[in-house]
């Protein structure tokens, strides 16, 4: 008799999830020799321990604490780039500007980027059929809790000037419900962080509006100011040009307004 299995609304665990996490870990330690001594099998064991045999709607930050013990990777605290709804450009930027880091440039972020995972209560099986959707099923699912935990720690580690890339093409350029708006903003430490600098990325080629005046940006400024952190904002009118100028800052066409 086939055993009854909970059907969730979201996609199931990414296929070959254990192999993917292990392979990513090994690759990361090869790319980042400062992490050469990390034992990726132990990392996977801790990752697995956070969600295997646990109800996928009952995951807590505590479940990830063993894995977070590895999260002491020393990213320069003044070189942190946060992002919201514009991941690809943020990652393209840090690939060029190698001394700046998004969460996905750290080991834990790199391991989990774009993956889905969940287990089942009281069995050691990984659920490849379906996993809880944040809206339709529950927010305390393995993936959401993971990102909330690592995002909080990443924001807490930041210092000096913190940059955030925001998508100017969205109706809410700053969204209070995004990970940035609900977790990272509130975990920047005022005693360490002097300024949050927002980069608003324009989508349209002919879009010359000052999106730093957008009501949601003003809302972000208000939240940040109340936390005793200074706020500044820049329009990035031409993201393609922006990246090109990061690659070749000496280019004569690279003026301050991009």
């Amino acid at each position: 008799v086939p055993r009854w299995r909970q059907q969730w609304s979201g996609p199931g665990t990414t296929k070959r999830f254990p192999e993917t996490v292990l392979a990513r870990c090994v690759k990361y330690t090869e790319i980042h020799p400062e992490m050469r001594h990390v034992d990726c099998q132990s990392v996977w064991d801790a990752f697995k321990g956070a969600f295997i045999s646990k109800h996928p709607c009952n995951i807590t930050e505590e479940d990830y604490q063993p894995l977070m013990k590895l999260g002491t990777q020393t990213v320069p605290c003044n070189k942190i780039l946060l992002w919201s709804r514009i991941k690809d450009l943020a990652h393209q930027f840090t690939q060029v500007q190698r001394d700046m880091f998004t969460l996905e440039d750290t080991l834990l972020g790199y391991l989990a980027d774009d993956l889905t995972w969940c287990g089942e209560f009281n069995t050691s099986k990984i659920n490849y059929q379906s996993c809880p959707d944040w809206r339709k099923d529950c927010s305390n699912n393995p993936v959401s809790v993971f990102w909330k935990t690592v995002s909080r720690r990443f924001a807490e580690a930041a210092c000096d000037v913190v940059h955030v890339m925001l998508n100017g093409s969205r109706s809410k350029i700053f969204d209070k419900n995004s990970t940035f708006g609900s977790v990272e903003v509130h975990n920047l430490q005022p005693e360490k962080v002097q300024t949050l600098e927002a980069w608003v990325i324009h989508g349209g080629r002919e879009d010359s509006r000052d999106l730093c005046q957008d009501p949601t940006i003003k809302e972000l400024e208000s939240i940040i100011s109340k936390r005793n952190i200074q706020f500044s904002c820049k329009n990035i009118y031409r993201p393609d040009k922006f990246l090109q100028c990061v690659k070749n800052p000496e280019d004569s066409s690279c003026t301050s307004e991009i």
């Epitope: 020799p33 400062e34 050469r36 001594h37 990390v38 034992d39 132990s42 990392v43 801790a46 063993p66 013990k69 590895l70 002491t72 020393t74």
Partner: antibody
Framework: QVQLVESGGGLVKPGGSLRLSCAAS????????MSWIRQAPGKGLEWVAS????????YYADSVRGRFTISRDNAKNSLYLQMNSLRAEDTAVYYC???????????WGQGTLVTVSS | QSVLTQPPSASGTSGQRVTISCSGS????????VYWYQHLPGTAPKLLIY???QRPSGVPDRFSGSKSGNSASLAISGLRSEDEADYYC???????????FGSGTKVTVL
């Protein structure tokens, strides 16, 4: 084959300075992390400092941070340890070691003795 | 006081199996590779085991390493007189941002 030869050890008074050198051969020196490890008389091994390849990043044990400086000269295939504000407890044999791809110390020199005494 | 804990001594007769333990924490052994070194007085230390259980070429298969959780062990089977030496475990420690060694175990062949 791989050879690591330390030099520069000797007797120095407390508060004094000394510079150790390690001449490397038999491998592509610039490719590898390098380290200094010491052993005080009658004691165990103690890691002192490491320096990365490429644009060098340095790492130090708490016991020497701020007093010792590790550096390298890839053109000369040489590793150095500048030791300032020396204390009696720094008395030890100092080994130069090459690190492997997984962080292990694959090759070691024969060591040079540093004695800090008045 | 070493961050990694080893027994001060271990002994066995020729041909016997001796095991040396090394106990640490999640900030070192837990998430990092364990290395084992053999040190004979007056000589340079020698790498015996890396990545928990890998032997460099030239190290006899009588030496084997293992790791479980926050602990590791080195086993020497078919003990020989030339195995008399000090043995050290080591690992990277995240909280110290550096390598840590065990206090060393003196192996005696009776």
């Amino acid at each position: 084959q791989v050879q690591l030869v330390e030099s520069g050890g000797g007797l120095v008074k407390p508060g004094g300075s000394l510079r150790l050198s390690c001449a490397a051969s038999g491998f592509t020196f610039s490719d590898d992390y390098m380290s200094w490890i010491r052993q005080a008389p009658g004691k165990g091994l103690e890691w002192v400092a490491s320096v990365s390849n490429g644009r060098p990043t340095t790492y130090y044990a708490d016991s020497v941070r701020g007093r010792f400086t590790i550096s390298r000269d890839n053109a000369k295939n040489s590793l150095y340890l500048q030791m300032n504000s020396l204390r009696a407890e720094d008395t030890a044999v100092y080994y130069c070691a090459r690190e492997g791809w997984s962080g292990e110390f694959t090759d070691w020199g024969q060591g040079t003795l540093v004695t800090v005494s008045s | 006081q070493s961050v990694l804990t080893q027994p001060p001594s271990a002994s066995g007769t020729s041909g016997q199996r001796v095991t040396i333990s090394c106990s640490g924490s999640s900030s070192n052994i837990g998430f990092h590779f364990v290395y084992w070194y053999q040190h004979l007085p007056g000589t340079a230390p020698k790498l015996l085991i890396y990545k928990n259980n890998q032997r460099p070429s030239g190290v006899p298969d009588r030496f084997s390493g293992s790791k479980s959780g926050n602990s590791a062990s080195l086993a020497i089977s078919g003990l020989r007189s030339e195995d008399e030496a000090d043995y050290y475990c080591a690992a990277w420690d995240d909280s110290l941002s550096g390598y840590v060694f065990g206090s060393g175990t003196k192996v005696t062949v009776l």
